[in-house]
């Protein structure tokens, strides 16, 4: 691939209200399920249509979730991270890292597993 792919990394606090079917997204990652090479962080892999996250509109597939209600998600097993979300209560505050691809030069291919979503 010619050209260079850069990333613009931003952080955002997203406050979600749990809907009738929950928060409405899927995650990958954890110390026992590294989705991104050399990174055991937790990433959003799916936003469910008409779920709380989709209706809010800010959380995106590929986002890295840094904390839930102030609790850091570093060094968690995958299932422990899942359980943390499930037990997070009605009002859930997510600290999220968005990683936006900035293309310089010819268009490149972003493969599955790239955290840019």
């Amino acid at each position: 691939m010619n050209g260079r792919v850069d990333y613009l990394v931003t952080e955002e606090e997203i406050n979600l209200t749990r809907g009738p079917s929950g928060l409405g997204f899927n995650i990958v990652g954890g110390t026992d399920q590294q989705y991104v090479s050399n990174d055991s962080g937790i990433y959003v892999s799916r936003i469910k249509e008409n779920g709380a996250a989709a209706l809010d509109g800010r959380l995106q597939e590929g986002d890295k979730i840094l904390s839930v209600n102030g609790q850091d998600l570093k060094n968690l097993l995958h299932q422990d991270a899942v359980d943390l979300f499930r037990n997070a209560g009605y009002a859930v505050s997510l600290r999220v890292q968005h990683r936006l691809q900035v293309q310089n030069g010819p268009i490149g291919h972003r493969g599955e597993g790239d955290p840019s979503g």
Epitope: S21, G22, L23, G24, F25, N26, I27, V28, Q33, Y35, S45, R46, K48, H78, Q79, V82, F85, R86, G111, E112, G113
Partner: nanobody, 125 residues
């Protein structure tokens, strides 16, 4: 885009066994939640079994007879079907979604899955 290809279907006598396979594309297969559904003629598609990071789930009608397993090195999920009955006759579909839901997992809800195979016919006589 995840592609799913099922194989292993066929015809068998009641009491016999079959093993279905579903091979998926993608290099992060170990993160997929995988499931098998089936649809008999004139009936709605029904849940059979699923396997997520946290374990396996089965429909009551197949518990003790069917076993779901996966081989992450081969990007494949299996459905071992023993003690087959005529009522197991159906087209069997593989389904997948990337990751684990942060909500209560409903393995039998087809809306939990984004990707579906074309199906493989199982006939028990």
């Amino acid at each position: 885009e995840v592609q799913l290809v099922e194989s292993g279907g066929g015809s068998v006598q009641a009491g016999g066994s079959l093993r279905l396979s579903c091979t998926a594309s993608g290099r992060t297969f170990s993160t997929y939640t995988m499931a098998w559904f089936r649809q008999a003629p004139g009936k709605e598609r029904e849940f059979v079994a699923a396997i997520s990071w946290s374990g396996a789930y089965y429909a009551d009608s197949v518990t003790g007879r069917f076993t779901i397993s996966r081989d992450n090195a081969k990007n494949t999920v299996y459905l071992q079907m023993n003690s087959l009955k005529p009522e197991d006759t159906a087209v069997y579909y593989c389904a997948a979604v990337i990751g684990s839901t942060v909500d209560s997992y409903r393995p039998g809800d087809h809306l939990e899955y984004d990707y579906w195979g074309q199906g493989t016919q199982v006939t028990v006589s």
